[in-house]
Amino acid sequence: KFSKQSWGLENEALIVRCPRQGKPSYTVDWYYSQTNKSIPTQERNRVFASGQLLKFLPAAVADSGIYTCIVRSPTFNRTGYANVTIYKKQSDCNVPDYLMYSTVSGSEKNSKIYCPTIDLYNWTAPLEWFKNCQALQGSRYRAHKSFLVIDNVMTEDAGDYTCKFIHNENGANYSVTATRSFTVKDEQGFSLFPVIGAPAQNEIKEVEIGKNANLTCSACFGKGTQFLAAVLWQLNGTKITDFGEPRIQQEEGQNQSFSNGLACLDMVLRIADVKEEDLLLQYDCLALNLHGLRRHTVRLSRKNPIDHHS
């Protein structure tokens, strides 16, 4: 619940907020979970903590990992985890699905596309906007503060929109880009190639040995009733039923949910009494429908209990 996925591109700025909230007066300590090493607060460091924010200026692929934040008050401590993944820049125009922020839908009356995470940064207008890597031109596109407005939305406006802005920190400028898909609402339903919302690709989930753990595979498939959409788990490339470990079971049936008007399915994998050998397995979340199949992988790591108060 108090873990958050964050991602960015190498050589860009990335700012991550602690998933545990507190009053501004509370102190927040940040640690690199794997080593339990404290993150410095001095701004001369490339990676430094600034209250509730963890700043990578700029980010490097080697920064990927789980960061722990502890919000300290006189009466309690609250612990949160930021799972940060920094990716290499793609050589081609395609933005892979693991770099995408949540899909937004628009219609003729409402076609705002907000630039994801921009409120975390110190930026000044105007924003630059691109669709499928092409700079947006023409009077139909209007950049307003932190969002883009498209006039007279048409189905052809659907696609991947990237916002680009500059973060300023103590006089130094850092580039930031963020991409999300925009779909055009239609009264009729439609289906899409599966989009896995959770887990993030190559996610590391922290678990405690001897305790129970749940993994959720969640994917969206389009709008309206979806025909032959499914999500499921595999262990080391094998169906759960064929793997033969009774402690690891897939929930019966798939839960339907809706996210931004899209039809989504969830499948929970329950691991009872987590054992050391479970950390060696690869857990694959598969999403498939009539358009195709996509998979994301999760591995488990042993939780490093820093905070016994929360």
Epitope: P96, L293, R294, T297
Partner: antibody
């Protein structure tokens, strides 16, 4: 022993049709996804199509979508590829392959059957 | 679609040599990467799946490594029967795609 045996290849004119078959033995055919992969003369491998064990899911490469249809008959342990509106660029050896792990990888392959599209 | 590239496209080596072939995906594919060997006039044969797991019956001189976008197939000591063409293939998402192949021939 797992065996896959393709048949049905031959010479056909552009615009013509052909139906390939793949007879499977040595495993529980209905439990596996099955695929067709082709190889043009002197070229690399190209995935063509796959079908799930339940026949619910059928996927195609863009180059054959709308022209080729994959199907299976579990009672006969046979995989099929119906090829219509054939083009010269469809000339290739067509392999049938068994999938592991929901299109994870191809662990067994047939010996292939040659399809030649020429006028 | 995910594009796969391989290098080199061909190489000449001697029996006993250590041979390394690389495969690169156009986007992140975790470890959903498989390697196949194909000899002239024959069907491909699975060598390695999941980037590094050796298929049953494949000699241990073959090994695979890598994750994300960059992968490697290594033959620690080339044997006469290893002269063939090697293909990588991604299975992260459809359409499934193969690399163009690397031909290993006798020096």
């Amino acid at each position: 022993e797992v065996q896959l045996l393709e048949s049905g290849g031959g010479l056909v004119k552009p615009g013509g049709s052909l139906r390939l078959s793949c007879a499977a033995s040595g495993f529980t055919f209905s439990s596996y996804w099955m695929s067709w992969v082709r190889q043009a003369p002197g070229k690399g491998l190209e995935w063509v199509s796959s079908i799930s064990g339940t026949s619910n899911y059928m996927y195609y490469a863009d180059s054959v979508k709308g022209r080729f249809t994959i199907s299976r008959d579990d009672s006969k342990n046979t995989l099929y590829l119906q090829m219509n509106s054939l083009k010269t660029e469809d000339t290739a050896v067509y392999y049938c392959a068994r999938d592991r792990g929901f299109l994870g990888y191809f662990d067994y392959w047939g010996q292939g059957t040659l399809v030649t599209v020429s006028s | 679609d995910i594009q796969m590239t391989q290098s080199p496209s061909s190489l000449s080596a001697s029996v006993g040599d250590r041979v390394t072939i690389t495969c690169q995906a156009s986007q992140y594919i975790s470890n959903y990467l498989n390697w196949y060997q194909q000899k002239p006039g024959k069907a491909p044969k699975l060598l390695i799946y999941g980037a590094s797991t050796l298929q049953s019956g494949v000699p241990s001189r073959f090994s695979g490594s890598g994750s994300g976008t960059d992968f490697t197939l290594t033959i620690s000591s080339l044997q006469p029967e290893d002269f063939a063409t090697y293909y990588c293939q991604q299975s992260q998402s459809t359409p499934l795609t193969f690399g163009p192949g690397t031909k290993v021939d006798i020096k």
